[in-house]
């Protein structure tokens, strides 16, 4: 009697043994089957999760766009005036529609090669107005044409031309026209075939974004979506040095495995230059926990603060002697056209640079740039893109529109936000595909080790508490 | 087919005045503008004179500013060019000439100026 | 002003040969130079302008370079119908101003 309830409590003991065992076992073993499953699914080829997804984003993207109305126009060219501005918006447009097209894999340098084409459909349900109203703007043939022709000569003839035109350095411009183009009346005098057509993202519609090479990951995971070239180029052509890098992916999805202390790097066609982003906290998305990565302030910093920033300083007068800061100018990528970049309300940019223009309320929750990345498989599931689009004017003898200026201006056109947050549905599947399934691995693995343990302890704790009874 | 044909030159005398013409064909002289440049016997090439696509602005040569007036009638798609207090200096070869980015891409075949007594 | 020094004023050259003509500007005009051919008797014709840019219609044996003040024509081969005066410009600032010319001549 005393031997089977020994011998009952010493198979207690031993299957809590065993269950332990296995659920210690389990651990590593689980974690190389999910790290295996992870490093087949996030491969960019045909019928793996990561690639079916990355065809065609199941996220719905929308640009909102806040256009910066000049309130005092005829002060500012008559007297060099401070620029009044109110923005006005959102208007909204759904993006990143389209799929990417000429997909072509390359199995020797295991690489895949595609173009992202563009489109932009207005959401008039997710905006303030129509695409029809109208808004005071810096002209921007007007503005671009002397930075162009720096030569006194042509600035005259430049002159009679916008004389003819009846232009002037601000214009009345629809929404439509001042994002996707219109028809100006001064370039539409040039007698030379040239492009007459002038907008913000002119053109967009019916264009491609690339051709992008990037590693498929089928070699080594840890290469997965980083661009190989653009454009057939490793390099840009635009910044000295090594600011013309292609630094990582395009942002959209990350080598899997990604650590709080990565610095996650990644190319924006839209703002011509290789940029990163740095945890910033970890955050839950529909119930699947993500880091939330946010473009740091010193990734806009000058050359003073960021020794590292020095060749994206490419011009010393505008941007005193590079102690300026928070605008890129990207007029090199935008065939010499005086187009800054910065962040939305001169957010993180130097005094000097907003001090001219009134209205501008920077704000760090509304106007920063973020990616919320699921660390296991690398996926951006929720992201936005906030950045604003600044043409310099500058005093021009030659040029009656521009005469009577008595300092250079980074004008303000519009900022934008481009969102896209993974779906409900979309959410409920990568939770059970990916996230669920490590959840209930993990506790499973907790559940043995801990039943295991607890088994193992009370049946030991009761054998050896009957041998001394019995030794009693 | 562009083409630019200058007429009026010949022989003046000194203090006299002389109306050249600039017949142009095959483009509107209002779009680019006009320019005069002379050569007199056996040197190098002077410009003279020049009026900027729609007549927003005209420019002359110190050594002619205030004797010569540059002018278009875009009607007839031809400029002129006013030589008054005429000297033996201004003989020369007169040609005129299509630019609108400065440099002269059509040229006339030239039009012989005497000022001689 | 800017002045527009050319240099050779002359120079004598055999079929086949390269020939190069330089033209130095008095300040800075960035690439705003042309450069013409005039034959006797005849009004000049454009050969390049922005420094480089090969006028269309013009042989390629023609080529220009420089930026700033100093400028260069060069003829790669030279053929018997590129015998003529040379003239470089400035479209850079008014009053617009020609080089003195270069005459090339036969050997």
């Known amino acids: 009697m005393g031997c089977d309830r020994n011998c009952g409590l010493i198979a207690g003991a031993v299957i809590g043994a065993v269950l332990a065992v296995f659920g210690g076992i389990l651990m590593p073993v689980g974690d190389m089957l999910i790290e295996k499953t992870i490093k087949r699914e996030v491969v960019l080829e045909e019928g793996t999760t990561a690639f079916k997804n990355w065809v065609k984003t199941g996220t719905t993207v929308y640009r909102q766009f806040w256009i910066f109305d000049v309130q005092n126009p005829d002060d500012v060219a008559k007297n060099s005036s401070k620029i009044k501005v109110k923005q006005r918006g959102p208007y909204t447009y759904r993006v990143r529609y389209l799929a990417k097209e000429n997909i072509t894999q390359d199995p020797e340098d295991h690489t895949v090669s595609f173009v992202q084409p563009n489109g932009a459909i207005f959401e008039p349900s997710l905006s303030v107005g129509t695409e029809d109203d109208n808004f005071t703007v810096l002209n921007l043939a007007v503005a671009a044409a002397p930075h162009i022709y720096q030569n006194s000569f042509v600035q005259v003839v430049l002159n009679s031309l916008i004389k003819k035109s009846k232009s002037s350095m601000f214009q009345t411009r629809s929404l439509k026209e001042l994002l996707w183009g219109y028809k100006d009346p001064f370039l539409s005098l040039v007698p030379y075939p040239i492009s007459t057509t002038v907008g913000v993202f002119y053109p967009y519609n019916d264009t491609v974004d690339g051709v992008y090479k990037v590693f498929n990951g089928k070699d080594n995971i840890s290469k997965v979506a980083i661009i190989e070239s653009y454009k057939g180029k490793r390099n840009l052509s635009y910044w000295p040095s090594y600011c013309d890098m292609i630094n990582g992916t395009d942002a959209a999805s990350f080598p899997p495995f990604v650590e709080k202390s990565r610095t996650l790097r990644f190319f924006s066609s839209d703002i011509c230059r290789s940029i990163y982003a740095v945890f910033g906290s970890e955050i839950d998305l529909k119930g699947i926990p993500v880091y939330r990565f946010v473009l740091p302030a010193n990734a806009f910093a000058s050359p003073l603060q960021n020794p590292d920033n020095h060749c994206f300083c490419t011009e010393k007068v505008i941007s005193n002697n590079c102690t300026s800061y928070g605008v890129l100018d990207i007029g090199k990528c935008k065939e010499g056209k005086p187009v800054y970049i910065s962040l939305p309300h001169f957010l993180h940019a130097s005094p000097d640079v907003s001090e001219p223009i009134e209205g501008l309320h920077p704000n760090e929750d509304e106007h920063r740039t973020y990616l919320d990345v699921e660390p296991i498989t690398g996926f951006t599931l929720q992201f936005a893109k906030r950045l604003q689009v600044n043409i310099l004017v500058k005093p021009a003898r030659k040029i009656e529109a521009l005469k009577n200026l008595k300092r250079p201006y980074i004008v303000p056109i519009l900022w934008l936000n481009e969102t896209g947050t993974i779906g409900d549905e979309k959410a409920e599947m990568f939770k059970t595909q990916v996230t669920g399934k490590i959840k209930l691995l993990g506790m499973v693995e907790m559940a043995l080790l801990g039943i295991g343990v607890v088994m193992f302890v009370a049946f030991m704790i009761s054998y050896c508490a009957c041998k001394s009874k019995n030794g009693k | 087919e562009v083409q630019l044909v200058e007429s009026g030159g010949g022989l003046v005398q000194p203090g006299g005045s002389l109306r050249l013409s600039c017949a142009a064909s095959?483009?509107?002289?209002?779009?680019?503008?006009i320019h005069w440049v002379r050569q007199a016997p056996g040197k190098g090439l002077e410009w003279v004179a020049w009026?900027?696509?729609?007549?927003?602005?005209?420019y002359y040569a110190d050594s002619v500013k205030g004797r010569f007036t540059i002018s278009a009638d875009t009607s007839k798609n031809t400029a002129y060019l006013q030589m008054n207090s005429l000297r033996a200096e201004d003989t020369a070869v007169y040609y005129c000439?299509?630019?609108?980015?400065?440099?002269?891409?059509?040229w006339g075949q030239g039009t012989l100026v005497t000022v001689s007594s | 002003d800017i002045q527009m020094t050319q240099s050779p004023s002359s120079l004598s050259a055999s079929v086949g040969d390269r020939v190069t003509i330089t033209c130095r500007a008095s300040?800075?005009?960035?690439?705003?130079v042309a450069w013409y051919q005039q034959k006797p008797g005849k009004a000049p014709k454009l050969l390049i302008s922005?420094?480089?840019s090969l006028y269309s219609g013009v042989p390629s044996r023609f080529s220009g370079s420089g930026s700033g003040t100093d400028f260069t024509l060069t003829i790669s081969s030279l053929q018997p119908e590129d015998f003529a005066t040379y003239y470089c410009?400035?479209?850079?600032?008014?009053?617009?101003?020609f080089g003195q010319g270069t005459k090339v001549e036969i050997k």
């Open positions: 922005y420094a480089t």
């Open positions: 000439a299509r630019s609108f980015f400065g440099y002269f891409d059509y």
């Open positions: 410009q400035q479209h850079s600032n008014a009053p617009l101003t």
């Open positions: 009026i900027a696509p729609y007549g927003g602005y005209t």
């Open positions: 300040q800075d005009v960035s690439n705003w």
């Open positions: 095959g483009f509107t002289i209002d779009a680019f503008g």
